[in-house]
Interface confidence: low
């Protein structure tokens, strides 16, 4: 085992168990979590004479580690005087010791309050030449306190001389005012009046506000991804609830079922954003089967400062279905930039809106922030599309030049996933386009020969296709450009992807 | 495929400190998230912290917090968990893993798709 120094705990009573007529008083000292034996606990009694009794050390049973207590009894004015208890341990270093002082009982006492308050800014909205920050420590037992500003967590060096304290009744209070430049004001930087009182810590912060003014609490109920749905079959949904002012009141979310039928257990998080706000997210797991069949979940959020309860409900999307069209293909190179390589995936034509693009590589699904993908949005028709981006390394297409860009669809079939394999060199490429749709059609446009089979290899051109405008007359996505070989004497092929 | 091959396990008493190496003996890590898992004895193998393929966000198990860092060197293929104030409980094989389904599921042993042998961790 290594050798741990002791942590020295001081041992007292409450002053208010202590009869006004006691004689003599015990206090101890206790030191715990050291290695190896011995430690020595000498106490300073001032003035006072007192008997010490130092109980043998006990193993905790878990570390191994040794613990003992030593105990001092004082008779006398023992009251108004403070005693040190000090505990060396040789072991840890020769001159290692740990001085405690404190007095026989601990008071009850009411903690203080902190708060901090800043100048206005003038009628105009502006910051003047300088800001005022005021920390006021309120409501607490009359003692001892320390005030210390901190500058993003950072000691300030501050004239605490204009401190003042003020007693109404039972109870102080203090405050302490920190000028600032408007230029510190503005940089940004969080301000912290933080209190010592009692060996307790205290604090409240601030800083700029953000320059627009805060909107009101605002909530938000996500449906499943269809990659967590029918993939992964294990489906979640998510409450946020935004823009919450940091208090004292609870953040309540509550979930229910329209059947009536018991929810799983949620998971909470939340989160203080950059611009001093809170976000408060809970996350369900729902039954696959309960999903799909419809039922409807709702998400109820209530605070003490909101007027009322925020209501948010999702179920499944109605209306028609329609499975994602898939385009894969990817850039050629670029000057400078031989080690690297884009590759773009439309999806088209899908409804309802929801789905999950996924990019795959030797048969792995990549983490999602390899890839950047649109939001869905509408077409000129009534389906939706999306593009997803993805940077190659030269590293990873030598090792094996064929990507995939799968769409997790609810209407996609047969196992509700579409994809498409695209190669950085089409020529090169060892793999075919692992599709579970058909391969795309190549479009003859000559005399009766419509619609014949493309080889199944990625969405690349043919080698002597040239790009030209879509022409209505040309079967296919009318907003796809299309390629056309111009071979002579050859019935003209089109390619149905991106120019 | 990528191969992971962890090391930097052994006994320690309570209250000291490891540092756990997971580096790719076949393959790059570089574009990957890694996850590191754990397994006691007679327990399921759970989830202990993940970072991502960039390195600028992490994730950590309530258990850990505070005391486990997760960090990684893809220059040298490699992702370190340092293990500070170790408990008797943190006794486990301790697993490195790619993580197959990106940011969701991080926590889920069946979003990860290759696995390291393992290394013993022992706190006494």
């Known amino acids: 085992a290594s050798t741990q120094s002791p942590s020295v705990f001081p041992l007292t009573r409450c002053c208010k168990n202590i009869p006004s007529n006691a004689t003599s008083v015990t206090l101890g000292c206790l030191a715990t979590g050291y290695f190896p034996e011995p430690v020595m606990v000498t106490w300073d009694t001032g003035s006072l004479n007192g008997t010490t009794m130092t109980l043998p050390a006990t193993t905790l049973t878990l570390s191994g580690h040794y613990a003992t207590i030593s105990l001092l009894t004082v008779s006398g004015a023992w009251a108004k005087q403070m005693f040190t208890c000090r505990v060396a341990h040789t072991p840890s270093s020769t001159d290692w010791v740990d001085n405690k002082t404190f007095s026989v009982c601990s008071r009850d006492f009411t903690p203080p309050t902190v708060k901090i308050l800043q100048s206005s800014c003038d009628g105009g909205g502006h910051f003047p030449p300088t800001i005022q920050l005021l920390c006021l420590v309120s409501g607490y037992t009359p003692g001892t306190i320390n005030i210390t500003w901190l500058e993003d967590g950072q000691v300030m060096d501050v004239d605490l001389s204009t401190a003042s304290t003020t007693q109404e009744g039972e109870l102080a209070s203090t405050q302490s005012e920190l000028t600032l430049s408007q230029k510190h004001w503005l940089s940004d930087r969080t301000y912290t009046c933080q209190v010592t009182y009692q060996g307790h810590t205290f604090e409240d912060s601030t800083k700029k506000c953000a320059d627009s003014n805060p909107r009101g609490v605002s909530a938000y109920l996500s449906r499943p991804s269809p990659f967590d749905l029918f993939i992964r079959k294990s489906p979640t949904i998510t409450c946020l609830v935004v823009d919450l002012a940091p208090s004292k009141g609870t953040v309540n979310l509550t979930w229910s079922r329209a059947s009536g039928k018991p929810v799983n257990h949620s998971t909470r998080k939340e989160e203080k954003q950059r611009n001093g706000t809170l976000t408060v997210t809970s996350t369900l797991p729902v039954g696959t089967r309960d999903w799909i069949e419809g039922e409807t979940y709702q998400c109820r959020v209530t605070h003490p400062h909101l007027p009322r309860a925020l209501m948010r409900s999702t179920t499944k999307t109605s209306g028609p279905r329609a499975a994602p069209e898939v385009y894969a293909f990817a850039t050629p190179e670029w000057p400078g930039s031989r080690d690297k390589r884009t590759l773009a995936c439309l999806i088209q034509n899908f409804m309802p809106e929801d789905i999950s693009v996924q990019w795959l590589h030797n048969e792995v699904q990549l983490p999602d922030a390899r890839h950047s993908t649109t939001q869905p949005r509408k077409t000129k028709g009534s389906g939706f599309f999306v593009f997803s981006r993805l940077e190659v390394t030269r590293a990873e297409w030598e090792q094996k030049d064929e990507f995939i860009c799968r769409a997790v669809h609810e209407a996609a079939s047969p196992s509700q996933t579409v994809q498409r394999a695209v190669s950085v060199n089409p020529g090169l490429a060892g793999g075919s386009a692992q599709s579970q749709r058909a391969p795309d059609r190549v479009l003859c446009h000559s005399g009766q020969q419509q619609g014949l089979p493309r080889a199944a290899g990625g969405s690349v051109p043919h080698p002597r296709c040239h790009c030209g405008a879509g022409r209505a007359d040309w079967p296919g996505p009318p907003e796809l450009d299309v390629c056309v070989e111009e071979a002579e004497g050859e019935a003209p092929w089109t390619w149905t992807g991106l120019c | 495929d990528v191969q992971l091959q962890e090391s930097g396990g052994g006994l320690v008493q309570a209250g000291g400190s490891l540092k756990l190496s997971c580096a790719a003996s076949?393959?790059?890590?570089?574009?990957?998230?890694v996850a590191w898992f754990r397994q006691a004895p007679g327990k399921e193998r759970s989830f202990v912290t993940r970072i991502s393929w960039s390195g600028t966000t992490s994730y950590y198990a309530d258990a850990v917090k505070g005391r486990f860092a997760i960090s990684r060197d893809n220059a040298k293929n490699t992702v370190y968990l340092q293990m500070n104030s170790l408990k008797p409980e943190d006794t486990a094989v301790y697993y490195c893993?790619?993580?197959?389904?990106?940011?969701?599921?991080?926590?889920?042993?069946?979003?990860?798709?290759?696995w390291g042998q393992g290394t013993q961790v022992t706190v006494s």
């Open positions: 893993a790619v993580a197959l389904y990106g940011n969701r599921g991080y926590y889920d042993v069946n979003a990860h798709s290759y």
């Open positions: 076949r393959g790059s890590l570089s574009r990957w998230d």
